[in-house]
Amino acid sequence: REEAKPYPLFPGPLPGSLQTDHTSLLSLPHTSGYQPALMFSPTQPGRPYTGNVAIPRVTSAGSKLLPPLAFKHTVGHIILSEHKDVKFNCSISVPNIYQDTTISWWKDGKELLGAHHAITQFYPDDEVTAIIASFSITSVQRSDNGSYICKMKINNEEIVSDPIYIEVQGLPHFTKQPESMNVTRNTAFNLTCQAVGPPEPVNIFWVQNSSRVNEQPEKSPSVLTVPGLTEMAVFSCEAHNDKGLTVSKGVQINIKAIPSPPTEVSIHNSTAHSILISWVPGFDGYSPFRNCSVQVKEVDPLSNGSVMIFNTSASPHMYQIKQLQALANYSIGVSCMNEIGWSAVSPWILASTTEGAPSVAPLNVTVFLNESRDNVDIRWMKPLTKRQAGELVGYRISHVWQSAGISKELLEEVGQNNSRAQISVQVHNATCTVRIAAVTKGGVGPFSDPVKIFIPAHGWVDHAPSSTPAPGNA
């Protein structure tokens, strides 16, 4: 493919000067937002050029010397971003007397052979032929960085161009990232981050739990001194250069922390209103246990689901849970704390209290005299309890007989299916006081309020019953 001649074939501007027509030697894709590459001349302006030249022999006429052969100056330094395409040239004008000229490309002292995009074009004129050798790289990588030169052999003479330095710039590349650490609470520690360009400089911002630590960047490498932590944190560093930023891996800084929950809980014994438990503490988080919490909730669809919390010392790892309902099922969890805080609650375990004595007395106790049978009839209602303390096994009836100077108490037991009883009159012309209590395997509950009835002398009958008032009617 023929290309337009990008510059005069014969020596133009002074060597070393940076002319705008040098720009045409560099062909770059013009994509949105792309900045033109920077180009630098390899020599200082005004300095005489004494590069690698070949002095040609005298022409056949014998009177006219040909100009010395040398590659024309081109851009000396190309800076571009990673993944961009680049094309650069070297050119030389060769008198037509020379035949079979070839140009080869070299990078950092090694010839570039094989599948490289090198094109050499020839533009013949009357006396000279302009040769332009182009080298293109698509999607440059950092490995393309280096010094590129052209070489041409003429009559066993080697002509070498000035180097073209390709600098591929990109996002910072980490050479040292912060590493995970386990640190002591409130103890200083260091994290190191190092990143390189090009382009330099590379500036470092530190990030802790997604928030920047330092308002002003530090030049790479950077050491962050953390004065101390009270909880786990994730640190990373941001490396910034002119091309953008790269974020390091996030590292977790583990510190001496809250304990693990207990690994075992044991139920030792239960009573009607207490449960004795012990536990094996979990990992203490490298900090001594301070105290523990026993959480208790009732396993009952009808309960309000509230949790009772009992705090206790960490040692011994044992606690007697009190104030419990009888014959109830409970879920129990244990957690412990150290200076940092509370552990999670252990898995919930099940425990039950045993039967207890009833907590409520029978209701509506009614007493009346049946004189024909010479006995006292007693009637009552089963106690109304939110919770049965245990299986009702019966009732205990207390009857006290009082007359002038005499007092005698008697106890009777009746089965759980009864709601009435008869007791024989013990003394006439006396007062009988009756109280009733419910009975379970767990014991005897409270007695009802006393109900009194007067037992007259033989032959005088009062059929009016005596009774305790119903709840709410007192």
């Epitope: 690994t263 075992e264 990992f283 898995p347």
Partner: antibody, heavy 125, light 111 residues
Framework: QSVEESGGRLVTPGTPLTLTCTVS????????MSWVRQAPGKGLEWIGI?????STYSASWAKGRFTISKTSTTMDLKITSPTTEDTATYFC??????????????????????WGQGTLVTVSS | AAVLTQTPSPVSAAVGGTVSISCQSS????????LSWYQQKPGQPPKLLIY???DLASGVPSRFEGSGSGTEFTLTISDLECDDAATYYC???????????FGGGTEVVVK
């Protein structure tokens, strides 16, 4: 944290064999440990447990056939009188949480959260 | 002793699909939720996946989901990956009994 079994080998029926489980990164005084076995091509079968305090509980089928004990860093499983049915890979596993009912002499495993690679026991005449 | 019955076995599904494994207990699991699921690949030890019927063990992806209470439990694996091919066991404990019961295992085949 890790657990590792050792001691598995070829034994003749009736020859007692002791397997050892060595733990690192945690303490047997803080964790219950369990033994589980798996016959070739079969499922998992729980053998027994030793609590942090040293109480042992065994599967109903395993009572009398196995003895579990421990030191500060190792737990042992003794197969008292192996039979060919005891050919299996034996795993030890850390018990993530355990509840013990001392008054009733039983305990319940919540989960087995860390397992060893297993050791193969072959019982053959 | 209580028995844990797993169904079906084997079960197969394509990559990206979903499988569900059932675990039925002959009596209520302790606390109704002390059931765990384990994954075992050939030549490897079991690995804890789920405990308390539905809580994921550390490092287990949320594609694994456990559900159920009492006597009926299910393990569901969604967005199946080739690496999920394994045998899955349920296991649990019971009140009044030290035995830790394992289900018979369910092999999951990923096509």
């Amino acid at each position: 944290q890790s657990v590792e079994e050792s001691g598995g080998r070829l034994v003749t029926p009736g020859t007692p064999l002791t397997l050892t489980c060595t733990v690192s990164g945690f303490s047997l005084s803080s964790n219950a440990m369990s033994w589980v076995r798996q016959a070739p091509g079969k499922g998992l079968e729980w053998i027994g447990i030793i609590s942090s305090s040293g109480s042992t509980y065994s599967a109903s089928w395993a009572k009398g056939r196995f003895t579990i004990s421990k030191t500060s860093t190792t737990m042992d499983l003794k197969i008292t009188s192996p039979t060919t049915e005891d050919t299996a890979t034996y795993f030890c596993a850390r018990v993530g949480f355990f509840v013990g009912y001392g008054a009733y002499d039983y305990g319940i495993i919540h989960r087995l959260d860390l397992w060893g690679q297993g050791t193969l026991v072959t019982v053959s005449s | 002793a209580a028995v844990l019955t797993q169904t079906p076995s084997p079960v197969s599904a394509a990559v990206g699909g979903t499988v569900s494994i059932s675990c039925q207990s002959s009596k209520s699991i302790y606390n109704n939720n002390w059931l765990s699921w384990y994954q075992q690949k050939p030549g490897q030890p079991p690995k804890l996946l789920i405990y308390d019927a539905s809580d994921l063990a550390s490092g287990v992806p949320s594609r694994f989901e456990g559900s159920g209470s009492g006597t009926e439990f299910t393990l569901t694996i969604s967005d199946l990956e080739c690496d999920d091919a394994a045998t899955y066991y349920c296991a649990g404990g019971y009140s009044g009994d030290s035995d830790y019961a394992f289900g018979g295992g369910t092999e999951v085949v990923v096509k």
